[in-house]
């Protein structure tokens, strides 16, 4: 399929050679001739510069499972719809789809050949890690907890008596051993109660009772004696 292109405009002057930049389209190969250059066109193309396609869908131009669309006759162009993982006018090129950096928010891209997966960082989800799970917007902390953002993450600051990621779990107020100096902790509907060991008093049994009967507190609440349970609200 060689086509000789005449030296229309002094193309053979002392400047660059006529094949510089390869004037042949669609994969045609260029060779210099005494008068100019000629293009040797691949199957299915013709014209001075291989610019005309004679390929139709009947020629099966789409590779790797590509579907030929249009191109019912030589005068209408065809296009190939390529399966995921392939590209090019004939689906002839395998795509490194991860090079397009499709995973957002620092997600790790995995090209499995037939499919692409994003392994998301903690706090992100979705096919492309596009959903920010650590955003307080629209996120409710249950049982009166408040959402606190920070460091790309969110957490719930829970009201007394509740715990867990969303404050949905009833917390054991005694789990942290809040009663000092050997005081015994009792869970209570409104919090906890400390029963202090002899010699200590206060909501958390944190104050020693002085030997003369006076405590380290400025003034003991009326009606409470050392050793009485102290309700912590």
């Amino acid at each position: 399929y060689p086509y000789d292109v005449p030296d229309y405009a002094g193309m053979l002057g002392s400047g660059p050679g006529p094949c510089d930049g390869n004037p042949c389209a669609n994969g045609g190969s260029c060779s210099e001739t005494p008068r100019s250059f000629e293009c040797t066109c691949p199957r299915g193309f013709y014209g001075l510069r291989c610019e005309v396609s004679g390929v139709t869908c009947a020629d099966g131009p789409c590779f790797n499972g590509g579907l030929c669309v249009g191109g019912a006759d030589p005068d209408s162009a065809y296009i190939c719809h390529c399966p995921p993982g392939f590209q090019g006018s004939n689906c002839e090129k395998r795509v490194d789809r991860c090079s397009l950096q499709p995973c957002r928010n620092g997600g790790l891209c995995l090209d499995l050949g037939h499919a692409l997966r994003c392994r998301c960082r903690a706090g992100f989800a979705g096919p492309r890690c596009e959903h920010d799970l650590d955003d307080c917007a629209g996120r409710a902390c249950a049982n009166g907890g408040t959402c606190v953002e920070g460091g790309g993450a969110h957490r719930c600051s829970c009201a007394l008596g509740f715990g867990g990621r969303d404050c949905r779990e009833r917390a054991d107020p005694c789990a942290a051993r809040p009663c000092a100096h050997g005081g015994r902790c009792y869970a209570h509907f409104s919090g906890l109660v400390c029963a202090c060991a002899p010699g200590y008093m206060g909501a958390r049994c944190e104050f020693p009772v002085h030997p003369d009967g006076a405590s380290a507190l400025p003034a003991a609440p009326p009606g409470l004696r050392p050793g009485d349970p102290q309700r912590y609200l």
């Epitope: 789409c62 579907l67 669309v69 249009g70």
Partner: antibody, heavy 118, light 108 residues
Framework: QVQLQESGPGLVKPSETLSLTCTVS????????WSWIRQPPGKGLEWIAY???????NYNPSLKSRVTISLDTSKNQFSLQLSSVTAADAAVYYC????????????WGQGTMVTVSS | EIVLTQSPGTLSLSPGERATLSCRAS???????LAWYQQNPGQAPRLLIY???SRATGIPDRFSGSGSGTDFTLTISRLEPEDFAVYYC?????????FGGGTKVEIK
């Protein structure tokens, strides 16, 4: 294994628009082409359209003037709209996943029957 | 568009027998881009064969496909009770994607 579920009204009036949605059970909607196929009662299969998340679409020429296919990656859903329906559009409508190697269909929804009647 | 004609329309056979189904295209199917499906009553089709001869995942080896150009064949070497169904061919080389009219394999 991924599952597909069609949803939409089972009864549509003549001249109105049929709207169907297909929900994909996992996050693979960006990895495949997705398609709609229909089957009139007692008859064979007819391909309607397909779509890819990049925006590529393709329609059956016999239906192209009346069909729109769309995709919502955030909801893992794709949808079909068929306007100006007639009794000839009554069929079981299937959504399907396009096979990763060529435009065959490897995963199908269970289908939803659409009746056209006033 | 490429028209696919399946024959016979109905095939009456007994379990254990060999079934041979034909799919003929009105023009060449490029690159053997042809698939076969099985459909049981009230169910969605199931992909059996792609690329004219490759079995899809989980398909028993009693199913085999062959052919190229315009003539394709699906063979079921020994019919099992669950194989009695309708079979469709589909070409996916040229848009629009088209299906054959189907062959019903029924119990004799």
């Amino acid at each position: 294994q991924v599952q597909l579920q069609e949803s939409g009204p089972g009864l549509v009036k003549p001249s109105e628009t049929l709207s169907l949605t297909c929900t994909v059970s996992d996050n693979s909607i960006s990895n495949y082409y997705w398609s709609w196929i229909r089957q009139p009662p007692g008859k064979g299969l007819e391909w309607i359209a397909y779509i890819y998340y990049s925006g590529t679409t393709n329609y059956n020429p016999s239906l192209k003037s009346r069909v729109t296919i769309s995709l919502d990656t955030s909801k893992n859903q794709f949808s079909l709209q068929l306007s100006s329906v007639t009794a000839a559009d009554a069929a079981v409508y299937y959504c399907a996943r396009v096979f990763h190697w060529g435009f065959a269909f490897d995963i199908w929804g269970q289908g939803t029957m659409v009746t056209v009647s006033s | 568009e490429i028209v696919l004609t399946q024959s016979p329309g109905t095939l009456s056979l007994s379990p254990g027998e060999r079934a041979t189904l034909s799919c003929r295209a009105s023009q060449r199917v490029s690159n053997t881009y042809l698939a076969w499906y099985q459909q049981n009553p009230g169910q969605a089709p199931r992909l059996l064969i792609y690329g004219a001869s490759s079995r899809a995942t989980g398909i028993p080896d009693r199913f085999s496909g062959s052919g190229s150009g315009t003539d394709f064949t699906l063979t079921i070497s020994r019919l099992e009770p669950e194989d009695f169904a309708v079979y469709y061919c589909q070409q996916y080389g040229t848009s629009p994607l088209t299906f054959g009219g189907g062959t019903k394999v029924e119990i004799k």
